[in-house]
Amino acid sequence: TIPPHVQKSVNNDMIVTDNNGAVKFPQLCKFCDVRFSTCDNQKSCMSNCSITSICEKPQEVCVAVWRKNDENITLETVCHDPKLPYHDFILEDAASPKCIMKEKKKPGETFFMCSCSSDECNDNIIFSEEYNTSNPDLLLVIFQ
C-alpha cells in the first residue's frame, strides 16, 4: 500500500467480507513509513504520525513496527494486507482492534510488530497487554 499522495486509481468491484460476513471497507491507518522515535521502555506509545491514510484495499489492516539497534530506534506505520508477510513475518493479530506489540526474532536488533483492524489503531502501540488505553500516564513518543 502507498500513502494518499502517490495512491493510484483502484476500481475493484469485489465486496470484501470478514469471517462473520461483515463488509470490510478500506480502513484508516497511520501511514508515516519509517520515522526515528524516542519510544523506549514504555508500556505504550503514541505514534505521533500526523498522516492518516485511507488504505488502498479493503482487506488491508494497520501495522506498526518498532525497531531498536545500537544506533537508533525507529517506528514504522503502514497499511498492509495480512495475507502477505511483512518483514518476513505473518500478521497473526490482524483481527485485533488494538495494536499489541509482539517481539520477533531479528539478528542484530530488537524487533516488535503489531497489526490491528480498527480505524487508526496503529496510532497507539501497546507493549504490555495489561495496559489500559485509558491510563492517564500515557507517554507520547516524540520524533526527531
Epitope: 486509481s9 461483515a22 463488509v23 471497507f25 478500506p26 485511507i54 480498527s118 480505524d119 487508526e120
Partner: antibody, heavy 116, light 107 residues
Framework: EVQLVESGGDLVKPGGSLRLSCAAS????????MSWVRQAPGKGLEWVGR??????????DYAAAVKGRFTISRDDSKNTLYLQMNSLKTEDTAIYYC???????WGQGTLVTVSS | DIQMTQSPSSLSASVGDRVTITCRAS??????LNWYQQKPGKAPKLLIY???SLQSGVPSRFSGSGSGTDFTLTISSLQPEDFATYYC?????????FGQGTKVEIK
C-alpha cells in the same frame, strides 16, 4: 450489506433539544470512525462532527458552528451512533446524515426542522 | 479551518461533453481531497478519494487530479446520469470542509 439508518428527526422550537440515532449493520461498527454531516435545504454539505473508536478513547471532534451544543456518542453494544442536539437554532434546520468517516457509506438522512 | 472554493458554481453541458470542475484549497492539503456526486433527494456518493483514486464501482469516465491547493474533477464524456451536484472535500485536517458545490445541468 452496509446499512446506516437514521431516526429521530422532528420539528422542534428554537432553544429546544433533540437526539438523533443511527442504527448500523453489515460491518464491524466498533472498528470504524463515525461522522454526522448535514445539509440545509437547497444548500451544500456541512460536516458536523465525528467520534473515533472506543478503543482509541472515543474521542470526538466538532465543527465550530455546533461545538458546545451538540454531542456525538456511540454505543458499540447496540451498533448505534447518536447525535444529541441542544440549544437548537433555526440555522440547524437540515437533513442530518450518518456516515462512516471518509468512506462511501451514508444513511438516507433524517430531517430536523427548527422553527417557532 | 481550511476553505474550499469550487468553480464554476454551475455549468450547462450536453451529453458527450468533456466537463471539468476545479477546487482550490486555502492552504496546501497534499492529496487529501475527495470528490462527491449528489443527486436531488439522495445522499452523496464518493467518486474520487486521495485526489485521483477512483472509488470502487465508479465509471472510468470520472478522473481526478491535482495536489497541494489546486484540484480538478474531469468527466471525459458526460452521460445523462451524470447531471448532478458535485462537491469537493478536504480530509487533510479537522474539520474536513466541503466546497460549496458545482451543479451540472443539461444544456
Amino acid at each position: 450489506e452496509v446499512q446506516l439508518v437514521e431516526s429521530g428527526g422532528d420539528l422542534v422550537k428554537p432553544g429546544g433539544s433533540l437526539r438523533l440515532s443511527c442504527a448500523a449493520s453489515g460491518f464491524t461498527f466498533s472498528n470504524a470512525w463515525m461522522s454526522w454531516v448535514r445539509q440545509a435545504p437547497g444548500k451544500g454539505l456541512e460536516w458536523v462532527g465525528r467520534v473515533k473508536t472506543t478503543v482509541s478513547g472515543g474521542t470526538t471532534d466538532y465543527a465550530a458552528a455546533v461545538k458546545g451544543r451538540f454531542t456525538i456518542s456511540r454505543d458499540d453494544s447496540k451498533n448505534t451512533l447518536y447525535l444529541q442536539m441542544n440549544s437548537l437554532k433555526t440555522e440547524d434546520t437540515a437533513i442530518y446524515y450518518c456516515t462512516i468517516d471518509l468512506r462511501d457509506y451514508w444513511g438516507q438522512g433524517t430531517l430536523v426542522t427548527v422553527s417557532s | 479551518d481550511i476553505q474550499m472554493t469550487q468553480s464554476p458554481s454551475s455549468l450547462s453541458a450536453s451529453v458527450g461533453d468533456r466537463v471539468t470542475i476545479t477546487c482550490r484549497a486555502s492552504q496546501s492539503i497534499s492529496s487529501y481531497l475527495n470528490w462527491y456526486q449528489q443527486k436531488p433527494g439522495k445522499a452523496p456518493k464518493l467518486l474520487i478519494y486521495a485526489a485521483s483514486s477512483l472509488q470502487s464501482g465508479v465509471p472510468s469516465r470520472f478522473s481526478g487530479s491535482g495536489s497541494g491547493t489546486d484540484f480538478t474533477l474531469t468527466i471525459s464524456s458526460l452521460q445523462p446520469e451524470d447531471f448532478a451536484t458535485y462537491y469537493c472535500q478536504q480530509s487533510y485536517s479537522t474539520p474536513p470542509t466541503f466546497g460549496q458545490g458545482t451543479k451540472v445541468e443539461i444544456k
